[in-house]
C-alpha cells in the first residue's frame, strides 16, 4: 500500500500511463521542514522499483529517468534515509504501460437475412492493455452515415442496428473502424460493399420430402426460402455415412427432385441459400431433415448351403442354411424367407415361409432327385430364388481337394489351403470352405459357416465366427456340376495345452487285455484341436517311470485296448491330452488288476 504523500511529492512525466518502450521521468521532492533534522545535506532520497533500489540522491529532490518498463503496472516508492534511523516512506507512484491500438484488420460486415441488421467484425490486433474505444462508421448513398461505438477492452464486433434493403442492390456502402486509447489511435482500411455482397440469407426452413407412389425413384425435396434467393445447395447422405452428396440448383423455387437415393435408407438432408451467382455468401446450412426412403423389392440372390445327414435306410435329414442379404440387396425389412422343396422327377413341391431364422431342417426320402429354392421377401416383393440340387457333396472321391491344411493367421483367423483334386482341375466350378465348432457328439445344432471361393483359388482366410482356443472342423468342397468331393481337417486360430486330462470312467478286462473308456474333455477345456491322447500306467507303489501309449485323436473314439499288463499286478492308470502347444495335466487316476492267467 502507498501512503498519502505528507512528507513530499512525486511527479510523473509525461503521464502515469505510457507507451511500451517509452521513457518516464519521476521526480521526488521533500516538502519544507520534512528532511533529516533540517540538515538538507544529510537527506538521502532513494527511489525503489518494487523492492529494488534504482536511484538515490542527497538533497531535497531526486530526479530519475526510467526506461524499459514491462506491460502492466510497475510500482515506484520514494523513501528518505537519515543517519541512525529507518528509511521513511515519502510518496509512491504507479506507472502503467500499455500499447497504442494496431490498425484493425479484416473488417467484414454481414446482414443476416433480408430483415436482419448490419453487423461488422474485425481483428483488433495486439492487446493494448488499455481501455480502447472502437468507432464503427458506415457511409452510404445520398451522404447517409451511421456510427456506433463500443467501449470495451476486447471489442471486435458491433451491430449498427440498421437494415439494408434491396431497393438499389448495386449501391455502395463503406465501413471503417477506428480504435482510440490514451496512447494513440488507428483506423482500418475501408471496406466497400453492396447489399448483395453482405446479405447472408437465413437458412432454408420447413424442409419436407415426398415419395410419389411410395417409390424411391420419385422423390422430391421441398423447403421455404427468403424471397430473393436465387441459388441453393443441397447436401444429403445416409445417416451412417460421413461423406455428403452435393447438388447445386438455380431458381429451384423451393423444390428439387432427387434421383439417386437408395431404398430403405435413412438419409440426412440439409439446404443452404444464396442471393447471387458470384456475390455474397451462402447461408448457414438448414436444420437437418432425417427421413427413411421407401422399400424396393430385394435384388441379388441368397447364398445357400446345406448339409445332409443319414437317418436310416429310407430317410435323410436335410439342413438348409443361408446368409442374410446385404442391406443394399435387401432394400427393405426382410419379412420372411420362402423355401421350396421339390422332387424333380415326380414334380411334387412343398413351400414354406420361414421367419426369424436363416436355416431350415426337414426329413426327406433317400430316393429321388431333390432340389430346393430359397428367396427373401420384403413388403415390395421377393428376391430371385437361389436353386440348389441336393447331392451327396462328398461322393466323388476324385473331386476331393488334396493336401488340405489349416494354419493360424493372426488373431482369430485361420488360413485354409489345399491343392486341386486329381481329376481334371478345370472341371471344378467353385470351392466351398465350411467350418463349425467341433463337438464330439456331432451336434447338428452347432452353427455352420461357409464361404465360396473361385475355382482358381487354392486358399481362403476364414475369420467369421472364429474364436481363440476352439477347435473347428473345416471342410473344403470342390463342386462340379451335380458332383462334389470333399476333404476335412481340424484347425484352430490359437491354442495352448488343454486345461485337464480325460476322465477314465471304466476299465474292463477282455481276453487277457484291458479296455479303457473315458469321457471327452469339455470343449471349453480343450484349448484348441486335440492331436493325441496318452494313456499312462505303472505298478502301484513303484517309483519307476510309467509306461505310455499314444493314440491319435479321433472325434468319435472314447475307448482303447491295452494288452501289455501283467496279470495279478495292481496298476495305476491315468490319461492326458495334447494339442500342438503341449500336454494337459493328468486326469483322474484309476487302479486295476488283471485277473487273467499268466502267459
Amino acid at each position: 500500500k502507498i501512503d498519502a504523500c505528507k512528507r513530499g511529492d512525486v511527479t510523473v512525466k509525461p503521464s502515469h500511463v505510457i507507451l511500451l518502450g517509452s521513457t518516464v521521468n519521476i521526480t521526488c521532492s521533500l516538502k519544507p521542514r520534512q528532511g533529516c533534522f533540517h540538515y538538507s545535506r544529510r537527506n538521502k532520497l532513494i527511489l525503489y522499483k518494487f523492492d529494488r533500489r534504482i536511484n538515490f540522491h542527497h538533497g531535497h529532490s531526486l530526479n530519475s529517468q526510467v526506461t524499459g518498463l514491462p506491460l502492466g503496472t510497475t510500482l515506484f516508492v520514494c523513501k528518505l534515509a537519515c543517519i541512525n534511523s529507518d528509511e521513511i516512506q515519502i510518496c509512491g507512484a504507479e506507472i502503467f504501460v500499455g500499447v497504442a491500438p494496431e490498425q484493425p484488420q479484416n473488417l467484414s460486415c454481414i446482414q443476416k437475412g433480408e430483415q436482419g441488421t448490419v453487423a461488422c467484425t474485425w481483428e483488433r490486433g495486439r492487446d493494448t492493455h488499455l481501455y480502447t474505444e472502437y468507432t464503427l462508421q458506415l457511409s452510404g448513398p445520398k451522404n447517409l452515415t451511421w456510427q456506433k461505438q463500443c467501449k470495451d477492452i476486447y471489442c471486435d464486433y458491433l451491430d449498427f442496428g440498421i437494415n439494408l434493403t434491396p431497393e438499389s442492390p448495386e449501391s455502395n456502402f463503406t465501413a471503417k473502424v477506428t480504435a482510440v486509447n490514451s496512447l494513440g489511435s488507428s483506423s482500418s482500411l475501408p471496406s466497400t460493399f453492396t447489399f448483395l455482397d453482405i446479405v447472408r440469407p437465413l437458412p432454408p426452413w420447413d424442409i419436407r420430402i415426398k415419395f410419389q407412389k411410395a417409390s424411391v425413384s420419385r422423390c422430391t425435396l421441398y423447403w421455404r426460402d427468403e424471397g430473393l434467393v436465387l441459388l441453393n445447395r443441397l447436401r444429403y447422405r445416409p445417416s451412417n455415412s460421413r461423406l455428403w452428396n452435393m447438388v447445386n440448383v438455380t431458381k429451384a423455387k423451393g423444390r428439387h427432385d432427387l434421383l439417386d437415393l437408395k431404398p430403405f435408407t435413412e438419409y440426412e438432408f440439409q439446404i443452404s441459400s444464396k442471393l447471387h451467382l458470384y456475390k455474397g455468401s451462402w447461408s448457414d446450412w438448414s436444420e437437418s431433415l432425417r427421413a427413411q426412403t421407401p422399400e424396393e423389392e430385394p435384388t441379388g440372390m441368397l447364398d445357400v448351403w446345406y448339409m445332409k445327414r443319414h437317418i436310416d435306410y429310407s430317410r435323410q435329414q436335410i439342413s438348409l442354411f443361408w446368409k442374410n442379404l446385404s442391406v443394399s440387396e435387401a432394400r427393405g425389412k426382410i419379412l420372411h424367407y420362402q423355401v421350396t422343396l421339390q422332387e424333380l422327377t415326380g414334380g411334387k413341391a412343398m413351400t414354406q415361409n420361414i421367419t426369424g431364422h436363416t436355416s431350415w431342417t426337414t426329413v426327406i426320402p433317400r430316393t429321388g432327385n431333390w432340389a430346393v429354392a430359397v428367396s427373401a421377401a420384403n413388403s415390395k416383393g421377393s428376391s430371385l430364388p437361389t436353386r440348389i440340387n441336393i447331392m451327396n457333396l462328398c461322393e466323388a472321391g476324385l473331386l476331393a481337394p488334396r493336401q488340405v491344411s489349416a494354419n493360424s493367421e493372426g488373431m482369430d483367423n485361420i488360413l485354409v489351403t489345399w491343392q486341386p483334386p486329381r481329376k481334371d482341375p478345370s472341371a471344378v466350378q467353385e470351392y466351398v470352405v465350411e467350418w463349425r465348432e467341433l463337438h464330439p457328439g456331432g451336434d447338428t445344432q452347432v452353427p455352420l459357416n461357409w464361404l465360396r471361393s473361385r475355382p482358381y483359388n487354392v486358399s481362403a482366410l476364414i475369420s467369421e465366427n472364429i474364436k481363440s482356443y476352439i477347435c473347428y472342423e473345416i471342410r473344403v468342397y470342390a463342386l462340379s456340376g451335380d458332383q462334389g468331393g470333399c476333404s476335412s481337417i481340424l484347425g484352430n486360430s490359437k491354442h495352448k495345452a488343454p486345461l485337464s486330462g480325460p476322465h477314465i470312467n471304466a476299465i474292463t478286462e477282455e481276453k487277457g487285455s484291458i479296455l479303457i473308456s473315458w469321457n471327452s474333455i469339455p470343449v471349453q477345456e480343450q484349448m484348441g484341436c486335440l492331436l493325441h491322447y496318452r494313456i499312462y500306467w505303472k505298478e502301484r507303489d513303484s517309483n519307476s517311470q510309467p509306461q505310455l501309449c499314444e493314440i491319435p485323436y479321433r472325434v468319435s473314439q472314447n475307448s482303447h485296448p491295452i494288452n501289455s499288463l501283467q496279470p495279478r499286478v495292481t496298476y495305476v492308470l491315468w490319461m492326458t491330452a495334447l494339442t500342438a502347444a503341449g500336454e494337459s495335466s493328468h486326469g483322474n487316476e484309476r487302479e486295476f488288476c488283471l485277473q487273467g492267467k499268466a502267459n
Epitope: D3, V10, V17, F76, H129, L130
Partner: nanobody
Framework: QVQLQESGGGLVQAGGSLVLSCAAS????????MSWYRQAPGKQRELVAE???????TYADSVEGRFHISRDNAKNIVDLQMNSLKPEDTAVYYC?????????????WGRGTQVTVSS
C-alpha cells in the same frame, strides 16, 4: 463501471480561480488514476493533470505551477484547483478514472463541465 460526476465549472475573469470537483461512484474501489482532461472547440482532447492512488501527480506543461490536483481516496473525489486562469484555459473539462482490470486498465469518463475564461 464507475460513474463520474463533475461540478464547479463556470464563467470567470482572466486571472481568477475555480475549483473543479469530480466524484466517483459505483465500483469505485481500486481506482488507479484520476485525471482531468480538457477539449477546446476544434481541438483534440488533452491531459491537464492526473493523480495516482498513491498521490503522485502529473501536470501538463501549460498548467504547471498554476493548477493543483488533489485526491481523497476514502471518498473517491478528485479536485482541480485552477489559479491564474487565462482565456486559453477555456474548454470543456472532463474527469476520467482508470481502474485496474486484470492486467489491463479500464477507463470511465464523466460528461464534462464547461469552463469559460473571459478577458
Amino acid at each position: 463501471q464507475v460513474q463520474l460526476q463533475e461540478s464547479g465549472g463556470g464563467l470567470v475573469q482572466a486571472g481568477g480561480s475555480l475549483v473543479l470537483s469530480c466524484a466517483a461512484s459505483g465500483s469505485a474501489a481500486l481506482i488507479f488514476l484520476m485525471s482531468w482532461y480538457r477539449q477546446a472547440p476544434g481541438k483534440q482532447r488533452e491531459l491537464v493533470a492526473e493523480v495516482s492512488r498513491g498521490g503522485s501527480t502529473t501536470y501538463a506543461d501549460s498548467v504547471e505551477g498554476r493548477f493543483h490536483i488533489s485526491r481523497d481516496n476514502a471518498k473517491n473525489i478528485v479536485d482541480l484547483q485552477m489559479n491564474s486562469l487565462k482565456p486559453e484555459d477555456t474548454a470543456v473539462y472532463y474527469c476520467k478514472a482508470d481502474q485496474n482490470y486484470g492486467d489491463s486498465l479500464r477507463s470511465s469518463w464523466g460528461r464534462g463541465t464547461q469552463v469559460t475564461v473571459s478577458s
